[in-house]
Interface confidence: low
Amino acid sequence: LIQERRSHEVNPAAHLTGANSSLTGSGGPLLWETQLGLAFLRGLSYHDGALVVTKAGYYYIYSKVQLGGVGCPLGLASTITHGLYKRTPRYPEELELLVSQQSPCGRATSSSRVWWDSSFLGGVVHLEAGEEVVVRVLDERLVRLRDGTRSYFGAFMV
Amino acid sequence: LIQERRSHEVNPAAHLTGANSSLTGSGGPLLWETQLGLAFLRGLSYHDGALVVTKAGYYYIYSKVQLGGVGCPLGLASTITHGLYKRTPRYPEELELLVSQQSPCGRATSSSRVWWDSSFLGGVVHLEAGEEVVVRVLDERLVRLRDGTRSYFGAFMV
Amino acid sequence: LIQERRSHEVNPAAHLTGANSSLTGSGGPLLWETQLGLAFLRGLSYHDGALVVTKAGYYYIYSKVQLGGVGCPLGLASTITHGLYKRTPRYPEELELLVSQQSPCGRATSSSRVWWDSSFLGGVVHLEAGEEVVVRVLDERLVRLRDGTRSYFGAFMV
C-alpha cells in the first residue's frame, strides 16, 4: 500500500490556469499561472507557456479555453483554432497534437449579440524528457480570461 | 504484477449519470444516479449531488451536460454556465474549479428552431478527504436528460 | 521505483487518429489509424474501428470529432449525434456509453456560410476483456478529417 500511494504521489501531473498575462498578442503560445489558486506542477516543469516533460511516457494532455465576443468582430477570422502543440529538440517546428476549429460567432442570437463558447481538447500522447507542450489559440483576442477556472491547461501521466 | 493490479483496483474512480431526478429546480446542484446502468463509485462516496473524497490526492474530475431547446426561451439567459464546484469544511462558500459559459441558443437555425449543444469540462484538482465536488448548470431548464449517456459526472485519482 | 515505472508501462492505453479511410459511408462506425504519426496501441487491440479490451477494468475513454460544413446541407439532419458505444458478446446490440447531440449548422452566421464545430466526449466506464468500443457520428458526412489531430479516439485504464 505504501508502494501504491507513492506511485500516485510521484505520478507526473499539472494543471495550469489562465491569468491576465496569458494573452501576449505576440503570436506566441498562451502563458499560464503555475502556482497560485488551483494551479500546480508535480513532476513536470514550466517554461514560457510550455509544460516541460521531465519523465518520458504517455500523457493525457488537455486544455480548455473560454471564448466570447459581440457578434463576429471585424479583424477576427470567423474560425477559431485551439490547439495543443509539441516542441521537440529533434525537430525545428512545433508539431500539432490535438486541434479544434470552431465558428463561435454563430452563437450570437438575434436577441443577443453577446456570445460565449468553450473549446475543450484532451488526448493521450507520448512525450520524451525535455519535450514541451504549448497551447495556441488563433485568434487569441476572443479568449476571455477571468479567474483561472474558464481557461486552463494540464497533463498527467497514464 | 499482483501489486500493479491491486493499485488499479483501489484507485478511486466514479462515473455518475443523469437521471429524471437530476434536475431539482431548487437552485441546488444537479443530482446523479450512482448505481444503475453505467454509474459506479469506487473509493469515492456520494451525498446529495456531491462526489465525496475519502482519500486525499489529485483527481481528474469531469462533467458533460446535454443542452437543448427551441429558440431561446424568454426568461432564460442567453448564456448558460456549467461548472464543477468544490465544497470544503474550511470555507463557507462553494469554490469554482472548472467553468464554461456557452450561448447555445445561437445554434438554432433559420430552418429549425430546435437546437442541441453539449458542454464538457475536465481537469485535475487537488482534493482533501471530506471535500465534495458538485455540478451546477444555470439555467438548468436547458439540460436535456435521457438515459445517462448524455449528461454525466465523474472523477478518478491521477 | 522500478515497480512503479513498470506499472505505467503496462497500463493499457491507446490513441487512434482520423484518416482518409475513417469515413466509410456504410453505416458502420468510424475507422481509425493505429500506428502512424500520433497513433498507438499499448495493452489494447484494434479491429474494424473498435478498441478491443484485453484486460478488464475501468477505462477513461474519449473521442473528439471535427465537424464542418457550408450552411446546413439538405438531406442532413440539423442534429449531429457523436457517441461512444460498447459491443459485448453478452448482448446483440451496441450499448450507448457516452453521447452528444449538437446542432452545428447554427454556427453558420448570416455573414459566413462556412462553419466549424468540435465535439468532445470523455468518461470512465467498466470494460471486460473482449469487449469493444466504437465511435459513431450521425451524419458522418459532416466530419472533417485532415491530419489526425482534429478527430481521434482513445482510452486508458484508470
Epitope: G71, L76, S112, V114 | - | S111
Partner: antibody, heavy 119, light 109 residues
C-alpha cells in the same frame, strides 16, 4: 426607440485632427458593435472601422490604420471617432452606425456629421 | 478599388421587377447586406443575411445569393424606391467591411 445622435459639423485645417461623437439616445451600445462610415461628396460609402464597447475592442480599415482612433464610453453610451492628419480628400459626411456584429448589417444610422477640410 | 462591384446605374419601369447585383470573391463565403440611400439622408438597411428584412421594410424587397454574386430584387418597383443602393460584406480576408460602389436606381413612368 434608440437613436444615434451625432455631434455637429466641423471645419478643419489640413494636418489637424477631428473628433466626432455619436450618442445612443434612449438605449446603450452594450450588446452591439458601432461602426463608422464616411461618404465624400457625390461618392460612395467607405468603412473606417468599429468598436465593441462591451470588450473595449477596436478594429480599423487598413487604409486608415494609424490615422483613425475609435473609442467608446459605455457609461454615457457614446462612441467617438478621431481622424488625424486631415487632408482635403477627408472632406465627407461621417456616419456612425449600429452594427449587428455577426450580421455585418448596420441597422441603425446617425444622421451624419459633415467634416470639411480646407485651408 | 472596391472588392465589391455594382453596376453604376439601373432603371426600371414603375411596377416592374428589377434586380441589382453585387459581385466579389468574398461573397462566396459571406452574405451581403443592402442599403437604400436617398439624397441628403443616411443609408437605411433593407436586406441582411440570407434574406432578412428589418421591420418596416416592404416585402417587395428580397435578397439572394449565388456563387460570387449577391442580388437585391425589388418586385413591383414604386416611385419611392428611386435611390442609391449599396451592398456591403466582409473583404476576402474576412477581416474588414467593404462596400460596393453603389447603384443608382431610376424608376421610369
Amino acid at each position: 426607440e434608440v437613436q444615434l445622435v451625432q455631434s455637429g459639423a466641423e471645419v478643419k485645417k489640413p494636418g489637424s485632427s477631428v473628433k466626432v461623437s455619436c450618442k445612443a439616445s434612449g438605449g446603450t451600445f452594450s450588446n452591439y458593435a458601432v461602426s463608422w462610415v464616411r461618404q465624400a461628396p457625390g461618392q460612395g460609402l467607405e468603412w473606417l472601422g468599429g468598436i465593441l464597447p462591451i470588450f473595449d475592442t477596436s478594429y480599423y480599415a487598413q487604409k486608415f490604420q494609424g490615422r483613425v482612433t475609435i473609442t467608446a464610453d459605455e457609461s454615457t453610451g457614446t462612441a467617438y471617432m478621431e481622424l488625424s492628419g486631415l487632408r482635403s480628400e477627408d472632406t465627407a459626411v461621417y456616419y456612425c452606425a449600429r452594427d449587428q456584429g455577426f450580421e455585418d448589417a448596420f441597422d441603425l444610422w446617425g444622421r451624419g456629421t459633415m467634416v470639411t477640410v480646407s485651408s | 478599388s472596391s472588392e465589391l462591384t455594382q453596376d453604376p446605374a439601373v432603371s426600371v419601369a414603375l411596377g416592374q421587377t428589377v434586380r441589382i447585383t453585387c459581385q466579389g470573391d468574398s461573397l462566396r463565403s459571406y452574405y451581403a447586406s443592402w442599403y437604400q440611400q436617398k439624397p441628403g439622408q443616411a443609408p437605411v438597411l433593407v436586406i441582411y443575411g440570407k434574406n432578412n428584412r428589418p421591420s418596416g421594410i416592404p416585402d417587395r424587397f428580397s435578397g439572394s445569393s449565388s456563387g460570387n454574386t449577391a442580388s437585391l430584387t425589388i418586385t413591383g418597383a414604386q416611385a419611392e424606391d428611386e435611390a442609391d443602393y449599396y451592398c456591403n460584406s466582409r473583404d476576402s480576408s474576412g477581416n474588414h467591411v467593404v462596400f460596393g460602389g453603389g447603384t443608382k436606381l431610376t424608376v421610369l413612368g
